[in-house]
């Protein structure tokens, strides 16, 4: 199934302006998600059941291994592009969690519906990152890297790669919402 | 249906090449193929699997590791090499399909036996 | 990781009566637990998976329960036919396992 973000090698052909206070709205996205994403690890966590609930540390601390770096105290341009990596990371990663779920809860209606509204707004962040590359550093192309394909895992192996991938969005996005 | 293949007498030590074979269809991206083995008298004991999509993860018991080599040799075929065999390999090895999240296995072959003796 | 410990490894039943098989795993795995079923020189065949779904074309006199680490297969108004060994197996976790099967019950 489709992730709900796929980047393309950007060429800075913009179709549409970009919106004014582009900026204001990249930091209002990125306080979107920092306000919600504590409510999220808590929803995947709990349906994900024993042994995930009593064993945080072990099996949901933000220990990812491949994650995309970012400095704080960086240029707009280099902390821009480095957002632009963490956000298709994180886009794919939540695209295979959803997928996974849908397999392993598909009752679990509550925690879809946030794991795809945040999937929404990464997918409007990345697209507003994007055109404040282009407009102003005229940046149309960046190396990413993508989230941990999670397909061929066991059920033990998806639920904790999800849980320790929630665990890490949590501690960076709070990170990302004070840089910006 | 999924059938087995390579079953033969083997001396100890020796190594020995065993094919499962997708018949009717081919491999989804989403599946698995597992080796199963039974000694004569004995009960089911789980060898290895491999997810045959791209990523090819696999997993094997805590035994065969090292001496047991899962591969996908084709969009149709998943082979399992042994090593340093020993007359306790003696079994029928069974190949069996899991479809995602690959928790039971729904799809078996009927099974081949290998002999190991001198 | 999760070892699968059967119980009985054999019992006798008159046809007519009700089998009960036990199934526990050293460590939760939630509802992650089939059975199959094995007659003599056959291959296993799947009867139940995530505890107590029923497999296509199986009987409804079989049921399964359970979750977390305690489970069982009950089989009602047994017939010869039902004469074979059964296992269970968890699916809940393949990494650093010994096997994921039970012992069977004969």
């Known amino acids: 199934s489709p992730l709900p973000i796929t980047p393309v090698n950007a060429t800075c052909a913009i179709r549409h302006p970009c919106h004014n206070n582009l900026m204001n709205q990249i930091r209002s996205q990125l306080a979107q998600l920092n306000g919600s994403a504590n409510a999220l690890f808590i929803l995947y966590y709990t349906a994900q059941g024993e042994p995930f609930p009593n064993n945080l540390d072990k099996l949901c601390g933000p220990n990812v291994t491949d994650f995309p770096p970012f400095h704080a105290n960086g240029t707009e341009k280099a902390k821009l592009v480095e957002l632009y990596r963490i956000v298709v990371y994180l886009g794919t990663s939540l695209g295979n969690i959803t997928r996974d779920q849908k397999i392993l809860n598909p009752s679990a209606l509550s925690l879809h519906s946030k794991l795809n509204a945040t999937a929404d707004i990464l997918r409007g962040l990345l697209s507003n990152v994007l055109c404040r590359l282009c407009s102003k550093y005229h940046v149309g192309h960046v190396d990413v890297t993508y989230g941990p394909d999670t397909s061929g895992k066991d059920v033990f192996q998806k639920k904790k790669l999800g849980c320790q991938l929630l665990g890490k969005y949590k501690q960076i996005i709070a990170v990302l919402a004070q840089a910006f | 249906s999924l059938e087995e293949s390579g079953g033969d007498l083997v001396k100890p030590e020796g190594s020995l090449t065993l094919t499962c074979t997708a018949s009717?269809?081919?491999?989804?991206?989403?599946?698995?193929i597992c080796w199963v083995r039974q000694a004569p008298g004995k009960g089911l004991e789980w060898i290895a699997c491999?997810?045959?999509?791209?990523?090819?993860?696999t997993y094997y018991a805590t035994w065969a590791k090292g001496r047991f080599t899962i591969s996908k040799t084709s969009s149709t075929t998943v082979t399992l090499q042994m090593t340093s065999l020993t007359a306790a390999d003696t079994a029928t090895y069974f190949c069996?399909?899991?479809?995602?999240?690959?928790?039971?296995?729904?799809?078996w072959g009927p099974g081949t036996l290998v002999t190991v003796s001198s | 990781t999760p070892d699968m410990t059967q119980t009985p490894a054999s019992m006798e039943v008159a046809v007519g009566g009700t089998v009960t098989i036990k199934c526990q795993a050293s460590e939760t795995i939630s509802g992650y637990l089939s059975w199959y079923q094995q007659k003599p020189g056959q291959r296993p065949k799947l009867l139940m998976y995530?505890?107590?779904t029923l497999a296509s074309g199986v009987s409804s006199r079989f049921k399964g329960s359970g979750s977390g680490t305690q489970f069982t297969l009950t089989i009602s108004g047994v017939e010869c036919a039902d004469a074979a060994t059964y296992y269970c197996?968890?699916?809940?976790?393949?990494?650093?396992?010994?096997?994921?099967f039970g012992g069977g019950t004969e």
């Open positions: 491999i997810y045959v999509g791209t990523s090819g993860d």
């Open positions: 069996a399909g899991a479809d995602n999240p690959y928790d039971y296995f729904n799809l």
């Open positions: 995530r505890a107590s």
């Open positions: 197996q968890q699916g809940y976790s393949y990494s650093d396992t010994d096997n994921v």
């Open positions: 009717g269809f081919s491999f989804s991206t989403d599946y698995w």
